[in-house]
């Protein structure tokens, strides 16, 4: 892409952060080997990536979690990549589901989501999971990002 | 991207190769339906992708493996995408973990890693796994690549 | 990428669709929050993405499925990203394999495939699975796309 001032690169990669909040929305931080190309993409409230320019973006998330079938609800672990555009309802862009492991005390699994989507100026994307307490925050295990085409 | 001579496309996609080496670093080859856009990215020693230009890269790896819980250590199978920059220590960019399957003789699982990272000239990226003997080298199962934004 | 008329963005993201066909090739639709940048990439017969311009493309697919080890064949669930170029045989670009879950009635798992490949004008890519009846078509679970570098 290597673009001029009129057309700068826009990309972000943020790192998961454990949170005491009881929300299902994952929390992220600009820490470790993170990427934030410029102010045309920002991390807001530690929970969503917000873009200033309209266009096509490749958006991705990776979530590693540790769960046990007996200790979890019957429903699988689901990670959802969601979109909130100004003046619109939230919508799901991508989801992945993994049934809990039978391993004791818990079995680790990794989920990867990614796709190309049109974003409007001011649009935000975020990641929801069924149980944030099961998410692994060790180096490199859980991350979230985007790049503008 | 479709760039001029000043700003050529830089991309690579290499294919896994079985190796007699006892190292945990996976081996790759320019074989099958591989991609190597030009000499601004190279595969060195069959183990790492090295870039000549600084910039933002989307880097990815996919690893398919076959393992059994009883025959493996208690630790899960972990695939790590690692970075070695000139004059710096190695660091982990991304990791994924999957608990071993209870299927006999082994259960296959696939891991996908991907993210956007800033690379310096001469930086190399490589893939580490906990047990290379479990990795699947059948057509398309295990691969590694990058593209410059 | 943000390109001029000579060099427009080319990208697609299509959504899985349940099908009564007995073929192992997954079916897709331009529905929901899909992307189809222009007529330089098209969805043909609901099954393949076809490009008009030669070049390097990042191609990806995500498949979520629900299966049970006892009710399935011994072979794992395999998702394959395949290429059909004009005048050439089909070939496998990427594959992922997941052993069926022991969960009852079935255990959900998600597979993600992605890589950079050179496509010729008129080339088509499609996704094959071992058992289409096991694929999850709920919002966001199964999708397929590409972007031109």
């Amino acid at each position: 892409m290597q673009k001029g001032d009129q057309n700068p690169q826009i990309a972000a990669h943020v790192i998961s952060e454990a949170s005491s909040k009881t929300t299902s929305v994952l929390q992220w931080a600009e820490k470790g080997y993170y990427t934030m190309s410029n102010n045309l993409v920002t991390l807001e409230n530690g929970k969503q990536l917000t873009v200033k320019r309209q266009g096509l973006y490749y958006i991705y998330a990776q979530v590693t979690f540790c769960s046990n079938r007996e200790a979890s609800s019957q429903a699988p672990f689901i990670a959802s990549l969601c979109l909130k555009s100004p003046g619109r309802f939230e919508r799901i862009l991508l989801r992945a589901a993994n049934t809990h492991s039978s391993a004791k005390p818990c079995g680790q699994q990794s989920i990867h989501l990614g796709g190309v989507f049109e974003l409007q100026p001011g649009a935000s994307v975020f990641v929801n999971v069924t149980d944030p307490s099961q998410v692994s925050h060790g180096t490199g295990f859980t991350s979230f990002g985007l790049l503008k085409l | 991207m479709q760039k001029g001579d000043q700003n050529p496309q830089i991309a690579a996609h290499v294919i896994s190769e079985a190796s007699s080496k006892t190292t945990s670093v996976l081996q790759w080859a320019e074989k099958g339906y591989y991609t190597m856009s030009n000499n601004l990215v190279t595969l060195e020693n069959g183990k790492q992708l090295t870039v000549k230009r600084q910039g933002l890269y989307y880097i990815y790896a996919q690893v398919t493996f076959c393992s059994n819980r009883e025959a493996s250590s208690q630790a899960p199978f972990i695939a790590s995408l690692c970075l070695k920059s000139p004059g710096r220590f190695e660091r982990i960019l991304l990791r994924a973990a999957n608990t071993h399957s209870s299927a006999k003789p082994c259960g296959q699982q696939s891991i996908h890693l991907g993210g956007v990272f800033e690379l310096q000239p001469g930086a190399s990226v490589f893939v580490n796994v906990t047990d290379p003997s479990q990795v699947s080298h059948g057509t398309g199962f295990t691969s590694f690549g990058l593209l410059k934004l | 990428m943000q390109k001029g008329d000579q060099n427009p963005q080319i990208a697609a993201h299509v959504i899985s669709e349940a099908s009564s066909k007995t073929t192992s090739v997954l079916q897709w639709a331009e529905k929901g929050y899909y992307t189809m940048s222009n007529n330089l990439v098209t969805l043909e017969n609901g099954k393949q993405l076809t490009v008009k311009r030669q070049g390097l493309y990042y191609i990806y697919a995500q498949v979520t499925f629900c299966s049970n080890r006892e009710a399935s064949s011994q072979a794992p669930f395999i998702a394959s990203l395949c290429l059909k170029s004009p005048g050439r045989f089909e070939r496998i670009l990427l594959r992922a394999a997941n052993t069926h879950s022991s969960a009852k009635p079935c255990g959900q798992q998600s597979i993600h495939l992605g890589g950079v490949f050179e496509l010729q004008p008129g080339a088509s890519v499609f996704v094959n699975v071992t058992d289409p009846s096991q694929v999850s078509h709920g919002t966001g679970f199964t999708s397929f796309g590409l972007l031109k570098l």
Epitope: - | A18, E70, A71, P105, C106 | -
Partner: nanobody, 115 residues
């Protein structure tokens, strides 16, 4: 290309013994396991036993205590010692191995247990 060749099958009386061998040939870089499956007429292929590269061995309940798996890593060969054979052990026995990052199968050897 790596190949697996089984030998040692044949006709044996109930209560008798046989020793099957599975030899891997070709350039072998890595081995995760070698093992045995069997398929009786009209039935699905079933797993019997596996020996892993770390020496761990596992058996299906139907053969536990009667069959013993072993491996000679220097020869890339696995063995299945079958004792106290029963008519229901009659099947084609297949060697299977995870070699060089792929699941390999032999052609099979027929074991018939009959008086």
């Amino acid at each position: 290309e790596v190949q697996l060749v089984e030998s040692g099958g044949g006709l044996v009386q109930p209560g008798g013994s046989l020793r099957l061998s599975c030899a891997a040939s070709g350039r072998i870089f890595s081995t995760y396991f070698m093992g045995w499956f069997r398929q009786a007429p009209g039935k699905e292929r079933e797993w019997i036993s596996t020996v892993y590269s770390n020496g761990h061995t596992y058996y299906a309940d139907s053969v536990k205590g009667r069959f013993t798996i072993s491996a000679d890593n220097s020869k890339n060969t696995a063995y299945l010692q079958m004792n106290s054979l029963k008519p229901e052990d009659t099947a084609v026995y297949y060697c299977a191995a995870w070699l060089n990052g792929g699941n390999r199968w032999g052609q099979g050897t027929l074991v018939t247990v009959s008086s």
